[in-house]
């Protein structure tokens, strides 16, 4: 039961996290005009990964997409890439984890396969979360650098060109959404990996095993390390965790082809 709960919770947390990463990537408010200690304007500027917007006090909002690829800063391109990689990995992870869920039975899929899938999806969620956190952090660092540069030089002018008040940008809502979403995806991934550890030993956690060796019978309940007799498929020493109290997961035990030798 604990394994199922951990796996299910990990899936849900990751799902929320990935939804958040998608939302953050699509949001326009990655950077917003800094209003502190600035002349108060009737126009509010904010920028996203894909377009920049201007909202007038009347409520009129105009957004313009970045229709160039080569003209964009390399850092912005890197952030875009990180967020997209995060989304793709997260989406694949979600797909894999659906089939890995213990509560969903697909054909005669063994627990070992589900354990592997759980681990795979968990790793994917961890990498996805890290990508999102990295992307948002890179953008935040870029903002901080630009903020202090524009603070040092509030007014810029080039040659005979018009002097323009440099608009300073600060952290937008999307950054916080991205950080939280990345963190949730990461946590969900870790939970999936933990759930995998609980799933993996179950294939060898037998209720009763009968060994016929050297003419005499040895029947025992597993506990501690299982003796390696060279029979069956269990040739490796595996620690069987048996706390005495049985969970619901352990109640239903179907005989496998290796149960009897």
């Amino acid at each position: 039961m604990a394994v199922t709960a951990c796996q299910g919770l990990g899936f849900v947390v990751s799902l929320i996290g990935i939804a958040g990463i998608i939302a953050a990537t699509c949001m326009d408010q990655w950077s917003t005009q800094d209003l502190y200690n600035n002349p108060v304007t009737a126009v509010f500027n904010y920028q996203g990964l894909w377009r920049s917007c201007v909202r007038e006090s009347s409520g009129f909002t105009e957004c313009r997409g970045y229709f160039t690829l080569l003209g964009l800063p390399a850092m912005l391109q890197a952030v875009r890439a990180l967020m997209i990689v995060g989304i793709v990995l997260g989406a694949i992870g979600l797909l894999v984890s659906i089939f890995a869920l213990k509560c969903i039975r697909i054909g005669s899929m063994e627990d070992s396969a589900k354990a592997n899938m759980t681990l795979t999806s968990g790793i994917m969620f961890i990498v996805s979360g890290l990508c999102a956190i990295a992307g948002v952090s890179v953008f935040a660092n870029m903002l901080v650098t630009n903020f202090w540069m524009s603070t040092a030089n509030m007014y810029t002018g080039m040659g005979g060109m018009v002097q323009t008040v440099q608009t300073r940008y600060t952290f937008g809502a999307a950054l916080f959404v991205g950080w939280v979403a990345g963190g949730l995806t990461l946590i969900g991934g870790v939970m999936m990996c933990i759930a995998c550890r609980g799933l993996a030993p179950e294939e060898t956690n037998y209720k009763a095993v009968s060994y016929h060796a050297s003419g005499h019978s040895v029947a025992y309940k597993p506990g501690g390390f299982k003796a390696s007799t060279g029979f069956g498929s269990n040739t490796k020493n595996k620690k069987i965790y048996d706390g005495g109290a049985r969970t619901e997961d352990e109640v239903q035990s179907y005989p496998s082809k290796h149960d009897y030798v």
């Epitope: 005009q33 304007t41 009737a42 500027n45 201007v54 009347s58 009129f60 105009e62 018009v162 608009t167």
Partner: antibody
Framework: QVQLVESGGGVVQPGRSLRLSCAAS????????VHWVRQAPGKGLEWVAV???????NYNSALMSRFTISRDNSKNTLYLQMNSLRAEDTAVYYC????????????WGQGTMVTVSS | DIVMTQSPLSLPVTPGEPASISCKSS????????????LTWYLQKPGQSPQLLIY???TGESGVPDRFSGSGSGTDFTLKISRVEAEDVGVYYC?????????FGGGTKVEIK
């Protein structure tokens, strides 16, 4: 059609208060911002204050301490509360609707005259 | 506060001839986000309320004759009347529509010679 009608003007003694009203029709005050602009006799236009559709307000810094802009959404009416009036506040007071684009003022009322005199 | 300076104070014109009014702001009215200049032009005809002519420095308000055109960027702006008509007389005002408080220029009185 869009119409703005100012009222409440008149002769008032220095130091006294006065409340101007601006009845709007043809649009909602919760959709468009409305400004107050004044014009002293024979002088140019002077921006007084604005209340935006969302309810936020901005003032002429020189008048902020004495003037308050407000509105009654149910009556679709705008108000300008003027306290501690001075002789230099004598002017025609216009209310004007904020254009949806460019922060301009696209519709103006006919104005109401306020005379501050002892 | 932003200071708006208009010139000339008075502009006598001949009907059918072009006219030009200048407006300078103490700070740029150009918004870097959308590359638009938040400068507005108004005309106040004698005995009337002002009317909006141009916003965003160069975009004509609907219903305004196309003989009126606005140009300029940053701090220097110009209103041009390609062919002045008798009905164009009045006082022209430019307005800062970017920084609070919004401020108007002193006005330019256009009159027929």
């Amino acid at each position: 059609q869009v119409q703005l009608v100012e009222s409440g003007g008149g002769v008032v003694q220095p130091g006294r208060s006065l409340r101007l009203s601006c009845a709007a029709s043809g649009f909602s005050l919760t959709t468009y911002g409305v400004h107050w602009v004044r014009q002293a006799p024979g002088k140019g236009l002077e921006w007084v204050a604005v209340i935006w559709a969302g309810g936020s307000t901005n003032y002429n810094s020189a008048l902020m301490s004495r003037f308050t802009i407000s509105r009654d959404n149910s009556k679709n009416t705008l108000y300008l509360q003027m306290n501690s009036l001075r002789a230099e506040d004598t002017a025609v007071y216009y209310c004007a609707r904020a254009a949806y684009y460019g922060n301009g003022l696209d519709y103006w009322g006919q104005g109401t005259m306020v005379t501050v005199s002892s | 506060d932003i200071v708006m300076t208009q010139s000339p104070l008075s502009l006598p014109v001949t009907p059918g001839e072009p006219a030009s009014i200048s407006c300078k702001s103490s700070q740029t009215l150009l918004n870097s986000g959308n590359q638009k200049n938040y400068l507005t032009w108004y005309l106040q005809k004698p005995g009337q309320s002002p009317q909006l002519l141009i916003y965003w420095a160069s975009t004509g308000e609907s219903g305004v004759p196309d003989r009126f055109s606005g140009s300029g960027s940053g701090t220097d702006f110009t209103l041009k009347i390609s062919r002045v008509e008798a009905e164009d007389v009045g006082v022209y005002y430019c307005q800062n529509a970017y920084f609070y408080p919004f401020t108007f220029g002193g006005g330019t009185k256009v009159e027929i010679k």
